[in-house]
Amino acid sequence: FKVATPYSLYVCPEGQNVTLTCRLLGPVDKGHDVTFYKTWYRSSRGEVQTCSERRPIRQLTFQDLHLHHGGHQAAQTSHDLAQRHGLESASDHHGNFSITMRNLTLLDSGLYCCLVVEIRHHHSEHRVHGAMELQVQTGKDAPSNCVVYPSSSQDSEQIT
């Protein structure tokens, strides 16, 4: 399986909300002994590979933000802890999973990573990640709403 990031760049005004999205692609084994662990964290374009470093998102670690379930089941993180920090991560039945960040500040700018771990009990873990950049802007040059740039090209879309 693979992880796709529909958008590689999100440019948002300060104070706006944004939802960063990843999508699980390809055949997904839904067997009894296969489960999925999904999470989000901040990172940098590291020397080993992008997303190899795991930093907190608004003080919440990847452990705090994880989703756990088998196959394509829907799941959500612990509401209380995440929502106190203006965060919510969720997953649907179609392989999409996301993190919503509310009331963006300049400090939220940076590289964000989604991580999917396919756990094949008795065999191994298979890790796949996706990366996307968030730029939070302020002042007269900031967009009025979030502008997203698809991963495949640099055509932008405005999110209202």
Epitope: T35, R54, F62, Q63, H68, H121, E125
Partner: antibody, heavy 117, light 107 residues
């Protein structure tokens, strides 16, 4: 803050079954791997196996025929049973939380189990 | 199973010196390797995950490097509390395995 506490008899007779319980406090047991690891006196660490929150288990092949790990989510506990023990099973037994694609980040303090008649 | 070999078995150094510990895997583990510190009578403590990332609260004097089969844990300047046994552990496949340990002792 999540804490782990092992409990169980410190002395087991040869050929009997070693039974230990790990109680998870300060957090949910409904995620992650919950593992048992042991350390014979003066030696290194050996992973025994885990139970995933979903109930899936995975055991070290070297011990698989003798090991059972189970979970009781209502009590926030998971347990180890090791059958047909010998003196070679004398060790400090640790329970630990293992996060997928990460590491053993939280450990119990360990409990010494001696196998002797 | 993957065998991890640590060297040296014992490292005798003085406080303030640099410690370099090695861990070699019998086959590639990518960068999926962790390091733990264990003091007498205590449980191991996670220091490094994914070969080079420090765990929460671990001082900057601890650093990890390597990928594939050869890994290094470096303690840039030994503090008195750093004298302990250090273990590496792989998680690319099950069974999860640990190295035999390196004891860092006071010279």
């Amino acid at each position: 803050q999540v804490q782990l506490q092992e409990s169980g008899p410190g002395l087991v007779k040869p050929s009997e079954t070693l039974s230990l319980t790990c109680t998870v406090s300060g957090g949910s047991i409904s995620s992650y791997y919950w593992s048992w690891i042991r350390q014979p006196p003066g030696k290194g660490l050996e992973w025994i196996g885990y139970i995933y929150y979903s109930g899936s288990t995975n055991y070290n092949p070297s011990l698989k025929s003798r090991v059972t790990i189970s979970v009781d989510t209502s009590k926030s506990q998971f347990s180890l049973k090791l059958s047909s023990v010998t003196a070679a099973d004398t060790a400090v037994y640790y329970c630990a939380r293992d996060i997928p694609a990460f590491a053993f980040d939280i450990w119990g303090q360990g409990t010494m189990v001696i196998v002797s008649s | 199973e993957i065998v991890l070999t640590q060297s040296p078995a014992t490292l005798s150094l003085s406080p303030g010196e640099r410690a370099t510990l090695s861990c070699r895997a019998s086959q590639s583990v990518n960068y999926y390797l962790a390091w733990y510190q264990q003091k007498p009578g205590q449980a191991p403590r996670l220091l490094i995950y994914d070969a080079f990332n420090r765990a929460t609260g671990i001082p900057a004097r601890f650093s990890g490097s390597g990928s594939g089969t050869d890994f290094t844990l470096t303690i840039s300047s030994l503090e008195p509390e750093d004298f302990a046994v250090y273990y590496c552990q792989q998680r690319i496949s099950w069974p999860l395995t640990f190295g035999g340990g390196t004891k860092v002792e006071i010279k």
